[in-house]
Amino acid sequence: GITNINCSGHIWVEPATIFKMGMNISIYCQAAIKNCQPRKLHFYKNGIKERFQITRINKTTARLWYKNFLEPHASMYCTAECPKHFQETLICGKDISSGYPPDIPDEVTCVIYEYSGNMTCTWNAGKLTYIDTKYVVHVKSLETEEEQQYLTSSYINISTDSLQGGKKYLVWVQAANALGMEESKQLQIHLDDIVIPSAAVISRAETINATVPKTIIYWDSQTTIEKVSCEMRYKATTNQTWNVKEFDTNFTYVQQSEFYLEPNIKYVFQVRCQETGKRYWQPWSSLFFHKTPETVPQVTSKAFQHDTWNSGLTVASISTGHLTSDNRGDIG
């Protein structure tokens, strides 16, 4: 960067090199060039010469003033016009940054995705700071008082093997940058209460041609958790509103859920589960599409990625898989 150049003088910023966005700042340049009494001192921002708000303070020093500085980053350097020198002589340069102190981190959430071997902690960092902001995640055992700290710039994955202070912990997040430090409230967790079961997946769908046509959705999870509650939501692709069905589930076998749907309409399905009575849900599964037939039965398999129609009794209507419309992976 600009900071690594050889200087023939000194450049500095008031109030500081990193300052709050929107502040008035002054950049000072002091020449110390052998055999040179500068005729003029020039300031450059990102390589472009500044024309205004420059004040000569004395023979060797000048000041550049900015009102309401809003750029997150800028490279500044200054030069001198020396007598008998054809070109300007470089004095020094500095990278400057503006931004905001961190907000108080909130919505601290820690979950253990089954089989992951990690506790994943996330939080809402608040408004963009524009400058380098680090987060320290504190994990303190309520049983031993031992505390571990983890430095990160976003979320953190903590190996459950490293959580050796029992099952109950406090977790909080400290946010810090050059302009300030804030700290979240403390979240109390029990490791057994924050496990999210292995993802539930819809594998196929079929519509059985009966007096009243019936659609069966087949879905499964690799979870070893015994008591699991699930929700399946579905809607016609043309609708905005979801219908939700709730299930108490035992994943010792593939689940089959029955729906009575309108004929000749494309539907979308999603499923999510949680350990019964616990706090956190899985994110909703990928969108699974199934078009109900006009009269003939239809099977939809996740293996195919586009719509195909066969002649004969079994009709395959194929899901397009991973659209993201209203597919928020919320765990709350």
Epitope: H138, K140, L142, E145, E147, Q149, E183, Q186
Partner: antibody, heavy 121, light 112 residues
Framework: EVQLVESGGGLVQPGGSLRLSCAAS?????????MCWVRQAPGKGLEWVSC?????????YYANWAKGRFTISRDNSKNTLYLQMNSLRAEDTAVYYC????????????WGQGTLVTVSS | DIQMTQSPSSLSASVGDRVTITCQAS??????LAWYQQKPGKAPKLLIY???KLAAGVPSRFSGSGSGTDFTLTISSLQPEDFATYYC??????????????FGQGTKVEIK
């Protein structure tokens, strides 16, 4: 057994500086731990000054009144904790103790003998 | 800023008395509280940690209780060597940006 020995106290003029040291033995410096400074003005109660957390990273904490004037640091190669005190005032006169449990808890099983800092003209 | 309020500031008692000292935190500190004993010219000595756990080598006449914001140190039968000053300390977190002190003001136990 953890042992803590403070040094560096003495008489200093207002506005002056002093660096206190705390030589530690018996602590596993490869594990996570807190080490702290606590002071006690003559005839007064205990007052927390600062702590340093050492683990996969280093974090420092200060009492509100100590921020900007006092700096805690440590040299793992010398097993020593430091407290750099600048812009000293008469009200900083106290016995300064180094304290730890040798682990990442904030109660203190082990205390040094204390070192007296006197700020006076 | 978590404030620790200890009471009483001093008390007079006789050998054999049951003595109770209380400490109140301005916010929930769970069970993260320690008690210390200090004698003149000496460094403090840890008595109780995690609100109720007895530190190594501390006589069983000392006990601690409480959680959340209200805590108690009890000496079941005061002995001559127990005349000293006692301090509580919150051991929850010091990372909070505005902490002035983590100790209570102290309770001096004197001979009646």
């Amino acid at each position: 057994e953890v042992q803590l020995v403070e040094s560096g106290g003495g008489l200093v003029q207002p506005g002056g500086s002093l660096r206190l040291s705390c030589a530690a033995s018996g602590i596993d410096f490869n594990s996570n731990y807190y080490m702290c400074w606590v002071r006690q003005a003559p005839g007064k109660g205990l007052e927390w000054v600062s702590c340093i957390y050492v683990g996969s990273h280093v974090n420092t904490y200060y009492a509100n009144w100590a921020k900007g004037r006092f700096t805690i640091s440590r040299d793992n190669s010398k097993n020593t904790l430091y407290l750099q005190m600048n812009s000293l005032r008469a009200e900083d006169t106290a016995v300064y103790y180094c304290a730890t449990s040798g682990s990442s808890v904030l109660y203190f099983k082990f205390w040094g003998q204390g070192t007296l800092v006197t700020v006076s003209s | 800023d978590i404030q620790m309020t200890q009471s009483p500031s001093s008390l007079s008692a006789s050998v054999g008395d049951r003595v109770t000292i209380t400490c109140q935190a301005s916010e929930n500190i769970y069970s993260f509280l320690a008690w210390y004993q200090q004698k003149p010219g000496k460094a403090p000595k840890l008595l109780i940690y995690s609100a109720s756990k007895l530190a190594a080598g501390v006589p069983s006449r000392f006990s601690g209780s409480g959680s959340g914001t209200d805590f108690t140190l009890t000496i079941s039968s005061l002995q001559p060597e127990d005349f000293a000053t006692y301090y509580c300390q919150q051991t929850n977190r010091y990372s909070n940006p505005d902490i002035y002190n983590v100790f209570g003001q102290g309770t001096k136990v004197e001979i009646k």
